[in-house]
C-alpha cells in the first residue's frame, strides 16, 4: 500500500517518499522507483537555507549602498546575506531594508544609549546638576563645574543647557 506520510527530510510524490534536497541545493528531479532525488548546488549569489524541494534557489539580498546599507555577513549557499547600516545610520526595520541617520540629542539632553546598526540613539533629559550644550549622538550630560573645588564661587547658576559660571570669591556684586 502506498505511504500517506514520509519521514523527516522526505516528501511524498507520486505515492512514494523522496529525499528532500539539503540546504544549499535545489531540486532537479524527483526520485522514482529506481532513482534517488537529483539535487544541484545553488549558484553564486544564491542560497537555500532549509531541506527543500525548491526548483529555484533564492537570490542573496543586495545591500544597496544608495539606501545606506553595507554587507555585515556575506551570504553562502546555505545562508542569506545580512545587511547592516553604514556608520552613523541604523536600520528602519528588523529586516534592515533601508537605513536612517542616527538621531542626535538636543541641548538639554544627553545620550543614554548610543545607537547601533539596528537601534536609534536613546536620549534622556539632563537633570539638575548636569548639562549638555550641544546637539550630539554621542555626548552624555556633563556635570556642572564645582566652583568650590577651584576656590571660586558660583556667579551664575547652571541650567540643563549651560554650565555654571564661576568667579572669584571677592567679586563685586
Amino acid at each position: 500500500e502506498p505511504p500517506t506520510a514520509c519521514r523527516e527530510k522526505q516528501y511524498l510524490i507520486n505515492s512514494q517518499c523522496c529525499s528532500l534536497c539539503q540546504p544549499g541545493q535545489k531540486l532537479v528531479s524527483d526520485c522514482t522507483e529506481f532513482t534517488e532525488t537529483e539535487c544541484l548546488p545553488c549558484g553564486e549569489s544564491e542560497f537555500l537555507d532549509t531541506w527543500n524541494r525548491e526548483t529555484h534557489c533564492h537570490q542573496h539580498k543586495y545591500c544597496d549602498p544608495n539606501l545606506g546599507l553595507r554587507v555585515q555577513q556575506k551570504g553562502t549557499s546555505e545562508t542569506d546575506t545580512i545587511c547592516t547600516c553604514e556608520e552613523g545610520w541604523h536600520c528602519t526595520s528588523e529586516a534592515c531594508e533601508s537605513c536612517v541617520l542616527h538621531r542626535s540629542c538636543s541641548p538639554g539632553f544627553g545620550v543614554k544609549q548610543i545607537a547601533t546598526g539596528v537601534s536609534d540613539t536613546i536620549c534622556e533629559p539632563c537633570p539638575v546638576g548636569f548639562f549638555s550644550n550641544v546637539s550630539s549622538a554621542f555626548e552624555k550630560c556633563h556635570p556642572w563645574t564645582s566652583c568650590e573645588t577651584k576656590d571660586l564661587v558660583v556667579q551664575q547658576a547652571g541650567t540643563n543647557k549651560t554650565d555654571v559660571v564661576c568667579g572669584p570669591q571677592d567679586r563685586l556684586r
Epitope: 533629559p125 537633570p127 539638575v128 546638576g129 548636569f130 550630560c141 556635570p143 564661587v153 558660583v154
Partner: antibody
C-alpha cells in the same frame, strides 16, 4: 545646627503686596539654594521658586513668574519672597526650605522654616 | 513639567499595620549617568512644616526610624511604613527634583482606623 526662621503671619488686602522673610543660620548661606513652597488651606505643597544667594540666580515656576520676586541679602543671611497683586487665592502658608548646598547632589529640602500664614481678605 | 501622582489619597490604618503609599511620575526620574532616582518623600503633621524622610528614592534621612523605607525606580515609587506607630499619623508627599519646576504629589493622608 541648620535653622530657618520666618517672619510672622500677615493679613493683607486684595491688590496689595507682601514680603515674607526667611533668616538662615548654621550653614553657608551664600552657596545653598533657598526654596519657597506654598500650601493653601487644606491643600498640597506647591513649589514657587528658588534663589542661590551668592549669585542671585533664581528659578520660578511658570505660574509664579511676574507674581513672585525672590531676593536674598547675604549680609544678614536672609532670603525674601515678595508676592504682588494679592488675591484671596493667595491665602496660604508660605514655607522657605534649604535646597542644594553647592554639592549639586542635595536638591531635596532637608530643612524647612516654620511657615508664614498670609491671609488675603478685604 | 513632570507630574507626580500619589495613591491612595487617604488610608485608614491601625497601630502596627504595614502601610504602602505609591507615587508615579510622568517621566523617568532615573538618570543613567549616576543611576540615581531624583525622588524624595516628606511627612507633614497638621500645623507643622514638612519633614524630609527619604531622598534618592530609598536613602533614609538621618534620624528617621527604619520602619520607613523607600523603593522603586524610573516612574514607580513606594513609601512603606512597616509597623505604623501613633506618631506616624500624618500626610505624606512625594516630590521629584529631576529638573525645574520641582513638583509634589497631591499627598496621602494616613488616618487612624
Amino acid at each position: 545646627q541648620v535653622q530657618l526662621v520666618q517672619s510672622g503671619a500677615e493679613v493683607k488686602k486684595p491688590g496689595s503686596s507682601v514680603k515674607v522673610s526667611c533668616k538662615a543660620s548654621g550653614y553657608t548661606f551664600s552657596t545653598s539654594w533657598i526654596e519657597w513652597i506654598r500650601q493653601a488651606p487644606g491643600q498640597g505643597l506647591e513649589w514657587m521658586g528658588s534663589i542661590l544667594p551668592g549669585s542671585g540666580s533664581t528659578n520660578y515656576a511658570e505660574k509664579f513668574k511676574g507674581k513672585v520676586t525672590i531676593t536674598a541679602d547675604e549680609s544678614t543671611s536672609t532670603a525674601y519672597m515678595e508676592l504682588s497683586s494679592l488675591r484671596s487665592e493667595d491665602t496660604a502658608v508660605y514655607y522657605c526650605a534649604r535646597g542644594d548646598d553647592g554639592s549639586y547632589v542635595r536638591w531635596y529640602f532637608d530643612h524647612w522654616g516654620q511657615g508664614t500664614l498670609v491671609t488675603v481678605s478685604s | 513639567d513632570i507630574q507626580m501622582t500619589q495613591s491612595p489619597s487617604s488610608v485608614s490604618a491601625s497601630v502596627g499595620d504595614r502601610v504602602t503609599i505609591t507615587c508615579r511620575s510622568s517621566q523617568s526620574l532615573l538618570f543613567s549617568v549616576n543611576q540615581k532616582n531624583y525622588l524624595a518623600w516628606y511627612q507633614q503633621k497638621p500645623g507643622k512644616a514638612p519633614k524630609l524622610l527619604i531622598y534618592w528614592a530609598s536613602t533614609r534621612e538621618s534620624g528617621v526610624p527604619d520602619r520607613f523605607s523607600g523603593s522603586g525606580s524610573g516612574t514607580d515609587f513606594t513609601l512603606t511604613i512597616s509597623s505604623l506607630q501613633p506618631e506616624d499619623f500624618a500626610t505624606y508627599y512625594c516630590q521629584h527634583y529631576y529638573s525645574y519646576p520641582w513638583t509634589f504629589g497631591q499627598g496621602t493622608k494616613v488616618e487612624i482606623k
